[in-house]
Amino acid sequence: GVFNYEAETPSVIPAARLFKSYVLDGDKLIPKVAPQVISSVENVGGNGGPGTIKNITFAEGIPFKFVKERVDEVDNANFKYNYTVIEGDVLGDKLEKVSHELKIVAAPGGGSIVKISSKFHAKGYHEVNAEKMKGAKEMAEKLLRAVESYLLAHTAEYN
């Protein structure tokens, strides 16, 4: 089956700065600010645009070893990033792939809102465990908070 999941997370960081750091420079920044979650991000093909393949290796203590992601769209003007998890033990034996869209919009009172849309493709007509969907959101939120803390402490960067 196919299952959709939506989530929103507020951030105190303005949209342009957050996109520049969390998304565009995330391959370098995230392993630096959250080494307890992600140990490395390796670009194994492509220039960062659509079609680029990345291998992400999780840190010791995380219940997954690695994922392979494909970049589907990078929209710098609208702070939008689409990518698909195409391989890895995170998919388990029931998922074919998971596509995510991350869109950062300005929040009315300053800061921004990170909107995440996800589509889970299960093998055959399996159901997708709600906890699995929630888990993906929690992982993204943990990484976002680590980036946010870094940006608050390093105000001259990613402006």
Epitope: V2, E6, S118
Partner: antibody, heavy 119, light 107 residues
Framework: EVQLVESGGGLVQPGGSLRLSCVAS????????MNWVRQAPGEGLEWISY????????YYIDSVKGRFTISRDNAKNSLYLQMNSLRAEDTAIYYC????????????WGQGTLVTVSS | EIVMTQSPATLSVSPGERVTLSCRAS??????LAWYQQKPGQAPRLLIY???TGATGVPARFSGSGSGTEFTLTISSLQSEDFALYYC?????????IGQGTKVEIK
């Protein structure tokens, strides 16, 4: 530029068959789920069928189950709808619609092809 | 199946006015809802997905809100090109279902 072009519509008698095609361009067709949506004259939109990017998952609305078959050929960037045992109530404009990668909203639509079932 | 009910069926408004369209689901669809615009003789166009996210290229005057069973599409200041039919669609459960539409016409 994303483009979806439907063809195969026309006039058919009740009980007859038609095969609709939708040719896609401007994107990697094999990455995307696809749908058929129809619109009877002067009426609203009705989703009728879905096929996943890999064709491992297929869904239909109850009223066309057993009569319509959705399929795709990723090598030809094409989506199909085989319609058998057609009824007067199947008369409509048939649109093929691309499903967004990360949500099941329909982000691009073809211009539609008209199917008229009448004796 | 989930029944989507839109109200009103027709809305007569003047250019420049603020417009609010409603969509109600017969059971919760979480945030898995889209809005489309359709003009006569044309295919539908995606405006909003995930209940509140604007599709690429859609003017900022269009906004969506709501979750669960109650949703709203707002056009902050109606332009002449906005007179059209508007549909909501849920994609939380199979079958995908679409509301009967709201026609926004010139007063």
């Amino acid at each position: 530029e994303v483009q979806l072009v439907e063809s195969g519509g026309g006039l058919v008698q009740p009980g007859g068959s038609l095969r609709l095609s939708c040719v896609a361009s401007g994107f990697t067709f094999s990455n995307y789920d696809m749908n058929w949506v129809r619109q009877a004259p002067g009426e609203g939109l009705e989703w009728i069928s879905y096929i996943s990017y890999s064709d491992h998952n297929i869904y239909y609305i109850d009223s066309v189950k057993g009569r319509f078959t959705i399929s795709r050929d990723n090598a030809k960037n094409s989506l199909y709808l085989q319609m058998n045992s057609l009824r007067a109530e199947d008369t409509a404009i048939y649109y093929c619609a691309r499903e967004a990668l990360a949500s099941s909203s329909f982000d691009y639509w073809g211009q539609g092809t008209l199917v008229t079932v009448s004796s | 199946e989930i029944v989507m009910t839109q109200s009103p069926a027709t809305l007569s408004v003047s250019p420049g006015e603020r417009v609010t369209l409603s969509c109600r689901a017969s059971q919760s669809v979480s945030g898995n809802l889209a809005w489309y615009q359709q003009k006569p003789g044309q295919a539908p166009r995606l405006l909003i997905y995930s209940a509140s996210t604007g599709a690429t290229g859609v003017p900022a005057r269009f906004s969506g809100s709501g979750s669960g069973t109650e949703f709203t599409l707002t056009i902050s200041s109606l332009q002449s090109e906005d007179f059209a039919l508007y549909y909501c669609q849920q994609y939380n459960k199979w079958p995908r279902t679409i509301g009967q539409g709201t026609k926004v016409e010139i007063k």
